[in-house]
């Protein structure tokens, strides 16, 4: 499996293809948004993962989870199973 890969970037063009480990079964895309922003400021995170549930449980730092749980940040996690399927903008 190949997936787009980038960490906490505000520019999707910074993502690059990466060959996953044999244990990885999905490509994940995580979008972190400030819902109060009129510009809908956001960052994107793309990666290989063993499962979508793993991403939801392990990607976010304690620091970010504080903002997510309080509603300051909003998170969307999408997963797919085909090569580079997480390459769409955002």
């Amino acid at each position: 499996l190949w997936c787009q890969d980038c960490t906490l970037t505000t520019n999707s063009s910074h993502c690059t293809p990466k060959q996953c480990q044999p244990s990885d079964t999905v490509c994940a895309s995580v979008r972190i948004t400030d819902p109060s922003s009129s510009r809908k400021d956001h960052s994107v995170n793309k990666m290989c993962a063993s499962s979508c549930d793993f991403v939801k449980r392990h990607f976010f730092s304690d620091y970010l989870m504080g903002f997510i749980n309080s509603g300051i940040l909003k998170v969307d996690v999408d997963c797919c199973e085909k090569d580079l399927c997480n390459g769409a903008a955002g």
Epitope: D41, S61, Y63, G66, L73
Partner: antibody, heavy 120, light 107 residues
């Protein structure tokens, strides 16, 4: 280009209260960022004091929490630091900085810093 | 609190050298690691965020790598303006903490 500028007294007496303000220009304090204070004693490393969001939500370093208050004034596009019961150990360069939480929590813009000396 | 330990504490090198500074966290911080450069009398400047992302405007000779507990900052070919003190910083949990710094000096 976001710019930050610290201001406040450079000398504070022991047991007194240190008060500093950070003026933000070139951007809104109500943006998708938190706003932080970091200090650096002479010749030493960096220590995070705490941070504030435009809503007034705060996070503080537990080692200083009992003495620290950070507040925000959206109408003036600025935020402030108060540190009470100061001692010589609080002598440091105090920096204000913008925190980019969308990219995980880094300090992407800094003020130039202001030296505060605690002495009688 | 998460302790951040940098090595070496100081380093002498020459213009053109390849230099690597390491930072170790006392527990896993995933990729929530940032690097700063500080020159005397100046504020720190963000170089690398999220372990490996180059901050806008920072020369490409700077690069970062690592995840979990071990991280590196590499300067591929030292320039005269690179002699400074470098700090790592974790943003995995509060309190946010910094390494003690690595002073890079001219040999």
């Amino acid at each position: 280009q976001v710019q930050l500028q610290e201001s406040g007294p450079g000398l504070v007496k022991p047991s007194g209260t240190l008060s500093l303000t950070c003026a933000v220009s070139g951007g809104s304090i109500s943006s998708s960022n938190w706003w932080s204070w970091v200090r650096q004693p002479p010749g030493k490393g960096l220590e995070w004091i705490g941070e504030i969001y435009h809503s007034g939500s705060t996070n503080y370093n537990p080692s200083l929490k009992s003495r620290v208050t950070i507040s925000v004034d959206k109408s003036k596009n600025q935020f402030s630091l108060k540190l009470s019961s100061v001692t010589a150990a609080d002598t440091a360069v105090y920096y204000c900085a913008r925190v980019d939480i969308l990219t995980g929590g880094n300090f992407d813009y800094w003020g130039q810093g202001t030296l505060v000396t605690v002495s009688s | 609190d998460i302790q951040m330990t940098q090595s070496p504490s100081s380093l002498s090198a020459s213009v053109g050298d390849r230099v690597t500074i390491t930072c170790r966290a006392s527990q896993s911080i995933s990729s929530y690691l940032n690097w700063y450069q500080q020159k005397p009398g100046k504020a720190p400047k963000l170089l690398i965020y999220a372990a490996s992302s180059l901050q806008s405007g920072v020369p490409s000779r700077f690069s970062g790598s690592g995840s979990g507990t071990d991280f590196t900052l590499t300067i591929s070919s030292l320039q005269p303006e690179d002699f400074a003190t470098y700090y790592c910083q974790q943003s995995y949990s509060t309190p946010i903490t910094f390494g003690q710094g690595t002073r890079l000096e001219i040999k």
